[in-house]
């Protein structure tokens, strides 16, 4: 559940030992972009292994990654964001395996935040709102959001709603009365950029009101 997916062509004979995945985050720190890579196998001995990216860079030919425990990380303004880069696992000067990747196809958005649910008594509904830092970004502005909610006692019975806005209305009659619900949201690029789901937002918990007998029974889900 790392948010990774395989992307690009893997090359080299020692593929099985050193296969890796990467995701990019654009304008993650002001105008800086980041690229994070990690080995698929968490038990790989990474002691002498380094990552390097070459091609589709501004002003430089190649950049080296910083090693942060088991992940490899670059934060830079130098991604061209046009064409493919070559990302290689290296020992010294020797490349063990490489992938050609267009960084615009492995974008992982930042998680949404400020998720809240407000009950409207007159309308008999719940207004779900959340925020995303991508509204302020120049590149990855258009996202598809996945709102997931469940009754807290139903561990794996999530209901998902996909939407492009940051506001959703849930009808009270579609929810169980006097029940505790958990809701969360994640995002994925949905226009020119491609990639992976963000991490989930922090969950928000809310309780539905009791049935109001004067207005009749609530519909079952």
């Amino acid at each position: 559940e790392s948010g990774y997916a395989q992307n690009g062509d893997l090359e080299d004979a020692e593929l099985d030992d050193y296969s890796f995945s990467c995701y990019s985050q654009l304008e993650v720190n002001g105008s800086q972009h980041s690229l994070t890579c990690a080995f698929e196998d968490p038990d790989v001995n990474i002691t002498n292994l380094e990552f390097e990216i070459c091609g589709a860079l501004v002003e430089v030919k190649c950049l080296n990654f910083r090693k942060l425990q088991e992940i490899y990380f670059i934060e830079t303004k130098k991604f061209l964001l046009i064409g493919k880069s070559n990302i290689c696992v290296k020992v010294g000067e020797k490349s063990l395996t490489c992938k050609k990747i267009d960084l615009t196809t492995i974008v992982k958005p930042e998680a949404p935040f400020d998720l809240s649910v407000v009950y409207r008594e007159g309308a008999n509904d719940f207004v779900v709102t959340f925020n995303t830092s991508h509204l302020q970004k120049k590149y990855v502005k258009v996202l598809m959001h996945d709102v997931a909610y469940r009754q807290e006692k139903d561990e794996n019975k999530w209901t998902h709603v996909n939407l492009s806005s940051t506001k959703l209305t849930l009808l009270q009659r579609k929810l169980q009365p006097a029940a505790m619900y958990e809701i969360k949201v994640r995002s994925i690029p949905d226009h020119y950029f491609k990639g992976f789901w963000s991490e989930w937002s922090p969950s928000y918990y809310f309780r539905t009101p009791e049935i109001n007998n004067s207005s009749g029974e609530m519909d079952p889900i």
């Epitope: 720190n29 994070t36 990690a38 425990q69 088991e70 992940i71 561990e155 794996n156």
Partner: nanobody
Framework: QVQLVESGGGLVRPGGSLRLACAAS????????MHWYRQASGRQREWVAT???????GYRDSVKGRFTISRDNAKNTVDLQMNGLQLEDTAVYYC???????WGQGTQVTVSS
Amino acid sequence: QVQLVESGGGLVRPGGSLRLACAASGIRFSLRNMHWYRQASGRQREWVATITAGGVTGYRDSVKGRFTISRDNAKNTVDLQMNGLQLEDTAVYYCNHGDTAYWGQGTQVTVSS
């Protein structure tokens, strides 16, 4: 298997400080956003703070400027430094790695005069 173990809670007077710690195992810690939640008696669980894999932090409004979340990827731990504690901060505090199917036992924080 995922394990989250919280510690550091206790009884403290208003205005006092505590530092909560959470040790995580069974996850690729440095790749995960980490969160603190809390649940007061008879109340819904609520989000308190987040630190992303990249180190960006976020806080609920009522704790901004008083609480600080931090992480140590080498030790797979996430801490919550709580200063200026108020009576309404009394709750059981839980850390979480984004999958709410997994919770630790929590650590009780009681602010009382």
